[in-house]
Interface confidence: medium
């Protein structure tokens, strides 16, 4: 025969729990009902009566089947240095994320707390571990051979330039310049100024030998009958 | 966690009184329910008088108009005045308390006992 099926609220067999979404109430001795996500207990069950729901009120909710006599509050508002992800709902709480250039100082269940700035790495120093959610940028100095010229969250020491004739050392805030070898001349009519082809490379400046990343002028080169020498171009 | 420290218990003549008293410490944010359960020798926890916050009480039958429940929910605890007592009210009276908000959520919490025996 099959089992009976008992309605709520039922005395549970002795050593037996209640069924899902159903609760123990210590006092009652009953299994009772629990209230679906979005509502709470208004009155709560009697031997004879089942749990009451209610819907939460505006600005409360409830995540999971339950039966607290109250809904729970949302939190507060997302602050200026936060997005808010999850709105407020019966059914979920406001959740607020920290936006971009913000890492969560102080997390709480769901979301964050407290949002702080990504730390930015002054020149001569870049980033040794990225930012993340949860944590702060790690600037580390830049090693010999390697530079940052900038002040940022993001940006890595770079390896020096590599020069035939260094007219300026790199230290860690400043790559190396480059110099001409080429012999000097006097400009021969019709000389023409070419630009030093030069590649952006993270704000920081390193001769190429591809003219079509070559933005800005480094160098003015005289343009003779013969070719350039050999290191004219920066290398 | 929640500690619960009973008390009152003690040795009474059948026709007498006892008032015994259980505090909860802990870990208490709002409480579903309160109150006592007895043992026997060779038998399980039975419930004998429990309060609900929001008012609603339940007794065993044996005890119906003999005792009586109540709770200071200022100072977390629960009463229970036992009246006319009989032979047959001895036992471990165990106190309880019934979580209704997180960590301990639905959670059960028991003190230690505190025996009660009436000579007949």
């Known amino acids: 025969l099959p089992a009976q099926v008992a309605f709520t609220p039922y005395a549970p067999e002795p050593g037996s729990t209640c069924r899902l979404r159903e609760y123990y109430d210590q006092t009652a001795q009953m299994c009772c009902s629990k209230c679906s996500p979005g509502q709470h207990a208004k009155v709560f069950c009697t031997k004879t009566s089942d749990t009451v729901c209610d819907s939460c009120e505006d600005s409360t909710y409830t995540q999971l089947w339950n039966w607290v006599p109250e809904c729970l509050s949302c939190g507060s508002r997302c602050s200026s240095d936060q997005v808010e992800t999850q709105a407020c709902t019966r059914e979920q709480n406001r959740i607020c994320t920290c936006r971009p250039g913000w890492y969560c100082a102080l997390s709480k269940q769901e979301g964050c707390r407290l949002c702080a700035p990504l730390r930015k790495c002054r020149p001569g120093f870049g980033v040794a571990r990225p930012g993340t959610e949860t944590s702060d940028v790690v600037c580390k100095p830049c090693a010999p051979g390697t530079f940052s010229n900038t002040t940022s969250s993001t940006d890595i020491c770079r390896p020096h330039q590599i020069c035939n004739v260094v007219a300026i050392p790199g230290n860690a805030s400043m790559d190396a310049v480059c110099t001409s070898t080429s012999p000097t001349r006097s400009m021969a009519p019709g000389a023409v100024h070419l630009p030093q082809p030069v590649s952006t490379r993270s704000q920081h400046t390193q001769p190429t030998p591809e003219p079509s990343t070559a933005p800005s002028t480094s160098f003015l080169l005289p343009m003779g009958p013969s070719p350039p020498a050999e290191g004219s171009t920066g290398d | 966690e929640v500690q619960l420290v009973e008390s009152g218990g003690g040795l009474v003549q059948a026709g007498g009184s006892l008032r015994l008293s259980c505090a909860a410490s802990g870990s208490i944010v709002s409480t579903n329910g309160m109150g006592w359960h007895r043992q026997v020798p060779g038998k399980g926890r039975e419930l004998v008088a429990g309060?609900?916050?929001?008012?609603?009480?339940n007794y065993a039958d044996s005890v119906k108009g003999r005792f009586t429940i109540s709770s200071d929910n200022v100072k977390n605890t629960v009463y229970l005045q036992m009246n006319s007592l009989k032979a047959e009210d001895s036992g471990v009276y165990f106190c309880?308390?019934?979580?209704?908000?997180?960590?301990?959520?639905?959670?059960?919490?028991w003190g230690q006992g505190t025996q009660v025996t009436v000579s007949s």
């Open positions: 309880y308390y019934q979580a209704l908000s997180s960590p301990n959520y639905g959670q059960t919490f």
């Open positions: 309060i609900r916050s929001d008012g609603f009480t």
